[in-house]
């Protein structure tokens, strides 16, 4: 087994969002069983959940988590102080805001306390794992007789986020979507006054402050225009 053991001051480098290593073992035993992968997400840079699939263990095991930041002032190994549980077995760790350093390489180590040689280490770029809260306070106003403008707020620095707006009328089978940059404003140039429109927005921490792939939850929808749903043959299918 060709493996690397990472230490808090190791100088290994990787451009991937994570890097998985395991401890070498001398013989086939329980310690050769792979540990589950840890998945971390940083929620609005307010807290971070690092979770793993505890049910993948052959028997219920309270795995332990340690973490540090590579090549930084925060390279001291820290124990998880707030475990998350699934059916009374550890399945994650929650880190608070003061423990999150978005722009330093986060190293997370999962270990089986009954088999200390059985451990796995991953390196994560937290700026690529941020999930913002859903956009709030959606508002619509008319710019002209046929033009609508949609605005919304985010509870994070505006320039760090990009957005996806979806809209449809009660008569549409599917959503129309439009990407919007950090200016968090969307204009619909041609509105049919006879139709009822629904809008919703989600946001992503990309590309100016990080390169996250995951979107926020959708905002609560906002509606505009005539309520023609009584005559709408597609309404029940859309809401199902």
């Amino acid at each position: 087994l060709n493996t690397t053991i990472l230490t808090p001051n190791g100088n290994e480098d990787t451009t991937a969002d994570f890097f998985l290593t395991t401890m070498p073992t001398d013989s086939l035993s329980v310690s050769t069983l792979p540990l589950p992968e840890v998945q971390c997400f940083v929620f609005n840079v307010e807290y971070m959940n690092c979770t793993w699939n505890s049910s993948s263990e052959p028997q219920p095991t309270n795995l332990t988590l340690h973490y540090w930041y590579k090549n930084s002032d925060n390279d001291k190994v820290q124990k998880c102080s707030h475990y998350l549980f699934s059916e009374e077995i550890t399945s994650g760790c929650q880190l608070q805001k003061k423990e999150i350093h978005l722009y330093q390489t986060f190293v997370v180590q999962l270990q089986d306390p009954r088999e200390p040689r059985r451990q796995a280490t991953q390196m994560l770029k937290l700026q690529n794992l941020v999930i913002p809260w859903a956009p709030e306070n959606l508002t619509l106003h008319k710019l002209s007789e046929s033009q609508l403008e949609l605005n919304w707020n985010n509870r994070f620095l505006n320039h760090c986020l990009e957005h996806l707006v979806q809209y449809r009328t009660d008569w549409d089978h599917s959503w129309t979507e439009q990407s919007v940059d950090y200016r968090h404003k969307f204009s619909l140039p041609s509105v049919d006054g006879q139709k009822r429109y629904t809008f919703r927005v989600r946001s992503r921490f990309n590309p100016l402050c990080g390169s996250a792939q995951h979107w926020s939850e959708w905002s609560h929808p906002i509606h505009w225009g005539s309520n023609t749903s009584k005559e709408n043959p597609f309404l029940f299918a859309l809401e199902a």
Epitope: V45, K97, H101, L102, Y103, Q104, Q127, N153, R155, F156, L157, N158, H159, C160, Y182, L208, C209, G210
Partner: nanobody, 124 residues
Amino acid sequence: QVQLQESGGGSVQAGGSLRLSCTASGFTFDDSDMGWYRQAPGGECELVTISSDGSTYYADSVKGRFTISQDNAKNTVYLQMNSLKPEDTAVYYCAAEPRGYYSNYGGRRECNYWGQGTQVTVSS
């Protein structure tokens, strides 16, 4: 709503002083890198100063003349500008970044990412 509101700009003679203020709302101020950028007419957006992860950075052109400070209780960041020169003439923008962005990550910025800015004019 996230907002940065600058004030304190104006016209001054070379050698004079100005103090710019920026009041922030809608985000956690003391968890952010706070700083100032400027843009002269026809010029590029230029970093003036920023406090990042406990360190403060200044552009070479303002070192020893400009000082950044902040009052977390008031969610306000200040830029004290002394010994002003005509080449300091620009629109000054207050900037906020996720904590540690500047010292560990970096990247070019456009001045229109933040507020409206405040005009500083220095005449000789």
